[in-house]
């Protein structure tokens, strides 16, 4: 059996990437990705490139970052194609079914590929110390690299459930990844945790004709809070609800709503509260923002450019659950999705959270118009 992914990440667009440390030839890497329901990853310009770089930078693999590592990607020059010295990809091309995009915003070549028009050549992504992407490097397809990158594509994912009072969270995703934190998960992902009193809870991401959701999850929270407040999805006390500027940074737990003073949570239907912070609650109706915020809150709207060109299966069977794949951030301070959002998103996350739409307009507007925008 192939080793589990060292780490993986996805964007709200449904594009997911996993990084694997395993010494193997190019064909074996391709087969390993296919076995997981994906394909060897493209690493095109923009958000896709950033997503992969974030995975690499999340930490060294085996060996502790002492040497340069080579990772197979879906980049090759076919037998009948020539080396093109003035092209960004030097005559190499990405193996994917999607129409070509701009390749100007790509990594440099660590070494110039050999000039040839006859032999098929593969290429790898070289990472200095295993974490810092140095660039592309030509490599004979039958040689062994240190690892490989897979890509997966889904129509819909499950945003992470908020922990509430949960502890010991563990995500088990369909393609052999175990993680303590995933911002988005594919259908088939199981999240287990402990509620207060060490009661185990488990929810599974399922997909149907409506979309994707966590079965057996009530109110977006894995374990209900004993109190009235949540901050960043976890239970909180009122004194901890003030942000650095004195604003109210919490949201009200299920069964509570923001009081008329806008500063504390009261039992739904109650009148004025007596305690308070300042500012606004995080739980508000969906909105659309134009600048990203680092903290992941919901709802959110994001330009689909986050995920760019997909390459794999959505696997679902009509109205039944879809065994798809994950959206996982590394366990660094900021997740892959957050990095992508900050780098790319034209529409984003408000403090309340706004709405993420899987949406890839090439304009700067995140406003849905008629499909033919001239009729908007």
């Amino acid at each position: 059996e192939h080793p589990t992914a060292d780490r993986a990440g996805c964007s709200a667009s449904g594009a997911c990437y996993s990084l694997h440390h395993a010494t193997m030839k190019r064909q074996a890497a391709e087969e390993a990705c296919i076995l997981r329901g994906g394909a060897l990853s493209t690493v095109r310009a923009g958000a896709e490139l950033r997503a992969v770089l974030a995975l690499l930078r999340a930490g060294p693999g085996p060996g502790g970052g002492s040497k340069d590592l080579l990772f197979w990607v879906a980049l090759e020059r076919r037998r009948s194609h020539c080396t093109l010295e003035n092209e960004p990809l030097r005559g190499f091309s990405w193996l994917s079914s999607d129409p070509g995009g701009l390749e100007s915003d790509t990594l440099q070549w660590v070494e110039e590929p050999q000039r040839s028009c006859t032999a098929r050549r593969c290429a790898v992504l070289q990472a200095t110390g295993g974490v810092e992407p140095a660039g592309w490097k030509e490599m004979r397809c039958h040689l062994r690299a240190n690892g490989y990158l897979c890509k997966y594509q889904f129509e819909v994912l499950c945003p992470a459930p908020r922990p509430g009072a949960a502890s010991n969270l563990s995500y088990r995703a369909p393609f052999q990844l175990h993680s303590a934190a995933l911002d988005f998960s594919p259908p088939g992902t199981e999240v287990s945790a402990l509620c207060r009193g060490q009661l185990p809870i488990s929810v599974t991401c399922i997909a149907d004709e409506i979309g994707a959701r966590w079965d057996k999850l009530s109110g977006d929270v894995l374990c209900p809070c004993p109190g009235r407040y949540l901050r960043a999805g976890k239970c909180a006390e009122l004194p901890n609800c003030l942000d650095d500027l004195g604003g109210f940074a919490c949201e009200c737990a299920t069964g509570f709503e923001l009081g008329k003073d806008g500063r504390s949570c009261v039992t739904s239907g109650e009148g004025q509260p007596t305690l308070g912070g300042t500012g606004v609650p995080t739980r508000r109706p969906p909105a659309t923002a134009t600048s990203p915020v680092p903290q992941r809150t919901w709802p959110i709207r994001v330009d689909e450019k986050l995920g760019e060109t997909p390459l794999v299966p959505e696997q679902d069977n009509s109205v039944t659950s879809i065994p798809e794949i994950p959206r996982w951030g590394s366990q660094s301070t900021m997740s892959t999705l957050q990095m992508s959002l900050q780098a790319e998103s034209k529409a984003t996350i408000t403090p309340s959270g706004s709405v993420i739409s899987k949406f890839n307009s090439t304009t700067s507007s995140a406003t849905p118009q008629a499909f033919d925008s001239s009729s908007a």
């Epitope: 999607d98 994912l157 979309g211 959701r213 977006d220 709802p299 997909p310 739409s357 949406f359 307009s361």
Partner: antibody, heavy 127, light 106 residues
């Protein structure tokens, strides 16, 4: 700019055939499910067909009224959506829209919604 | 198939007036989407999954409901809101739309 441009509509006789096309641009076409929705003159909207993307094995779904007569298909390499209409009936007369199926995330769920509509192409079935 | 019945089929409202369009399903559905269409243009997604406004939709619009009963509400009617509205379910195939609900400016 997100855009879908339908073509292929026109006047056709009953029992005839027509193939509608929709050229999509401005978004990553091959990651989205797509629909055809029609609207008879002065009437409401009626869903016709849906096709999933490659990752869902291009699964197709049809309204009962068009099953065995219409075929939805796509060409991801060209960002094209098609509707092959055979054995046309006068009641198929309508404006046909190609529609993208977007995904919206709210709370801990993701929702499908028909978020972008083309400008439509008119089909008239008459003898 | 799930039949969606919208009411009223036609209604007039004055500027500033509160407007409610209802959509009743023949059997229970999980969520309802709403679309707006103006003459000569394509429909636009207006409200998704019952209560979430699509981007660019004014905050005076809201959606609510569950089971077999859903509604779209405009807190204060404005001239630009005059249009035809459709509800849509996707809980089961075939996907169905409600009959047109035409909102006119009085």
């Amino acid at each position: 700019e997100v855009q879908g441009v339908e073509s292929g509509g026109g006047l056709v006789q009953p029992k005839g055939s027509l193939k509608l096309s929709c050229a999509a641009s401005g978004f990553t076409f091959n990651t989205y499910a797509m629909h055809w929705v029609c609207q008879a003159p002065g009437k409401g909207l009626e869903w016709v067909a849906r096709i999933r993307s490659k990752s869902n094995n291009y699964a197709t779904y049809y309204a009962d009224s068009v099953k065995d007569r219409f075929t939805i298909s796509r060409d991801d390499s060209q960002s094209m959506l098609y509707l092959q209409m055979n054995n046309l009936k006068t009641e198929d007369t309508a404006m046909y829209y190609c529609v993208r199926e977007g995904v919206y995330y709210y709370g801990s769920s993701g929702y499908y919604a028909m978020d972008y509509w083309g400008q439509g192409t008119s089909v008239t079935v008459s003898s | 198939e799930i039949v969606l019945t919208q009411s009223p089929a036609i209604m007039s409202a004055s500027p500033g007036e509160k407007v409610t369009i209802t959509c009743s399903a023949s059997s229970s559905v999980s969520y309802m989407h709403w679309f707006q269409q103006k003459p000569g243009t394509s429909p636009k997604l207006w409200i998704y999954s019952t209560s979430n406004l699509a981007s660019g939709v004014p905050a005076r619009f809201s959606g609510s409901g569950s089971g077999t009963s859903y509604s779209l509400t405009i807190s204060r009617m404005e001239a630009e809101d005059a249009a035809t509205y459709y509800c849509q379910q996707r809980s089961s195939y075939p996907l169905t739309f409600g009959a047109p609900g035409k909102l006119e400016l009085k």
